[in-house]
């Protein structure tokens, strides 16, 4: 093949090489950009910067490196728009920083950075922690601040990410009320700072105030749809980010819901129960409490984390005929108590029976000296003889 | 010092109506949320009414349920309670409370209580 | 509705003397709070949230229990402490009062 007479010539399928001196100052427009998998960079001295327009288009990128180049700075959102770049090689250049935000969200497997004159600061804090726990291969670049010593070495007592405080009401929230919720931040060097609200939808209608160090935000009008509702608070600075996240508890009355008995491993009576707080329950059975045992019991299902409504089940362990009847729930919290009842049928009473009936003449042998305790049943057998229960 | 004091109390006959009010001073009326609290004569007490620090909820007791309303005015630092139908029953000692702030935990009882204004329901 | 009996309707004891006041609960509840009336004043919070004591409040009152009985103690008995004593829970709707105790000093 004749050699490439361009700045940046393929390599292999779906590779690029740029690697002709001073050929590039920016990454724009680069051939091929959209199905590159590889970039390979070398002797760009007037390639200093790397910012999120450089390598948009390059979303299937896999591997970059850009070595013993010009490279001063590369932009926090650099590599937005390569989020499968899992080797980033960018040894022999002119950084002295990196900022914890541009790996942020990908899934490095190697990053070079050696022959840097870096400089040891807070914010690579967070490259000394790859070092200490072995990622990307850092540990054994042996990492050098210029004319400071190794990376490793680097005092970082005073680097941490924001502290974050947020202060929620101390009395109990009702529906319609408005909450002032105010996150207190402290640190170094803050940068950014913020709340995310991406799950209040329509529980309350939102109003920011304030900035750092101190953001306020008012939760007006609120609905019951707040609760169970994560509201977060956010700090960065060049160390890290923080988040603090918190939920408001909005009361409102009890609710219930009971709905038709089915027979799964054991009988369930399946019902839904809501409020803030969560109801106490009471079943009664045929208007007379209901005391729970081994065979009959109240049991919840998993609840959801994001939603105060409860499900679960009234359990029967083999109901016979006398558990057929009016179920009740009753459920209570301070604010309210609601009710549900329903009529349940297990097992059709074995003596009950109409005289007029003609009495079948083929009978199904019965052992009169049965000591057994459990009840028999048999299915779809006719004529039917006498069939006894006994418990 | 927290301070309530009702007042609108007086003789009312069955089916009448009256307004009874508590005045708020001492402390951030907005803040906190409020109660009515009866006490018939050699009877226990009875609570009657809630309303939530904005006024947007409210909670009655079935007894009075339909008749009473409670409300108020947070630029005035005033409660409010509307008795339509009064009936004898009703006859009693009203005492306005403020609902005490122990935390997020919805159980807090009520910390500060009116003298009372006494309600009178006969022929 | 959640009924709260309170025993013995009266009482009647000397100062110095230990009173105990009792509760019950027609069903569990989360927490009971205590009062005390004196005769043509408004109730006073005494206890909240079971076993908390209110502002103000001689460290000679305590409340104790759970479930569906709970006390109020007074360790050592003083002559003011003559009124009568309800107890209320706040935990189901809607909100009810014991009957009362009437605590009267020799």
């Known amino acids: 093949a004749a050699p490439c007479p361009d700045a940046c010539c393929p390599h292999g399928s779906s590779g690029l090489r740029c690697t002709r001196d001073g050929a590039l100052d920016s990454l724009h427009h680069l051939p091929g950009a959209e199905n590159l998998t590889e970039l390979y960079i070398e002797n760009q001295q007037h390639l200093q910067h790397l910012e999120l327009r450089d390598l948009r288009g390059l979303g299937e990128l896999r591997n970059l490196t850009i070595v013993k180049s010009g490279l001063r700075f590369v932009a926090p959102d650099a590599f937005h728009f390569t989020p499968r770049l899992s080797r980033l090689n960018l040894s022999f250049n002119a950084l002295e920083s990196l900022s914890w935000k541009t790996v942020q969200g990908l899934s490095l497997q190697e990053l070079v950075l050696s022959g840097n004159p870096l400089h040891c600061s807070c914010a690579l804090r967070w490259l000394q922690r790859w070092e200490e726990e072995g990622l990307g291969g850092v540990p054994e670049q042996k990492l050098q601040c210029h004319g400071q010593g190794p990376l490793a070495h680097m005092p970082n007592a005073s680097c941490g990410v924001p502290t974050l405080k947020v202060q929620v009401p101390n009395a109990s929230v009702d529906v319609g009320d408005d909450v002032l919720l105010r996150c207190q931040v402290e640190g170094r060097g803050l940068e950014q700072a913020g709340w995310i609200l991406t799950e209040l939808e329509q529980s309350a209608t939102v109003m920011k105030s304030g900035g750092l160090p101190s953001l306020g935000l008012t939760l007006a009008n609120v609905t019951s749809d707040l609760n169970r509702k994560n509201v977060t608070c956010w700090a960065e600075n060049d160390v890290g980010r923080a988040e603090v996240s918190v939920q408001v508890n909005v009361s409102f009355p009890a609710s219930v819901q009971l709905h038709t008995a089915v027979e799964m491993h054991h009988w369930c009576i399946p019902f839904s129960v809501d409020g803030q707080p969560a109801p106490s329950l009471r079943w009664l059975f045929n208007g007379s409490v209901l005391n729970e045992t081994s065979f009959i019991f109240t049991e919840f299902l998993e609840p959801a984390a994001n939603e105060t409504v409860r499900h679960g089940c009234l359990r029967l362990n083999q109901p016979t005929h006398v558990n057929n009847g009016n179920y009740t729930l009753l459920a209570a919290n301070p604010f309210g108590q609601a009710s549900a009842s329903i009529m349940a049928a297990f097992m059709d009473n074995p003596f009950e029976f109409n005289p007029e009936d003609p009495i079948p003449v083929s009978f199904s042998p019965v052992d009169t000296n049965s000591t057994s305790g459990d009840p028999v049943e048999k299915k779809d057998e006719t004529p039917f003889g006498v069939s006894v229960a006994v418990g | 010092e927290v301070q309530l004091l009702e007042s609108g109390g007086g003789l009312v006959q069955p089916g009448g109506s009256l307004r009874l009010s508590c005045a708020a001073s001492?402390?951030?009326?907005?803040?906190?949320?409020m109660s009515w609290v009866r006490q018939a004569p050699g009877k226990r007490l009875e609570w009657v009414a809630y309303?939530?620090?904005?006024?947007?909820?409210?909670y009655y007791p079935d007894t009075v349920k339909g008749r009473f309303t409670i409300s108020r005015d947070n630029s005035k630092n005033t409660l409010y309670l509307q008795m339509n139908s009064l009936r004898a029953e009703d006859t009693a000692v009203y005492y306005c409370?403020?609902?005490?702030?122990?935390?997020?935990?919805?159980?807090?009882?009520?910390?500060?209580w009116g003298q009372g204004t006494t309600v009178t329901v006969s022929s | 509705q959640i009924v709260l009996t309170q025993s013995p309707a009266t009482l009647s004891l000397s100062p110095g003397e230990r009173a105990t006041l009792s509760c019950s609960a027609s069903s569990s509840v989360s927490y009971m709070h205590w009062y005390q009336q004196k005769p043509g004043q408004s109730p006073r919070l005494l206890i909240y949230?079971?076993?908390n004591l209110a502002s103000g409040i001689p460290s000679r009152f305590s409340g104790s229990g759970s479930g569906t009985d709970f006390t109020l103690t007074i360790s050592s008995l003083e002559p003011e402490d003559a009124a009568d004593y309800y107890c209320h829970q706040w935990s189901s709707y809607p909100w009810t009062f014991g009957g009362g105790t009437k605590l009267e000093i020799k």
């Open positions: 001492g402390f951030t009326f907005s803040t906190y949320t």
């Open positions: 309303i939530s620090k904005g006024g947007g909820s409210t």
């Open positions: 949230t079971t076993s």
């Open positions: 409370a403020r609902g005490a702030m122990y935390g997020n935990d919805f159980f807090y009882p009520m910390d500060y």
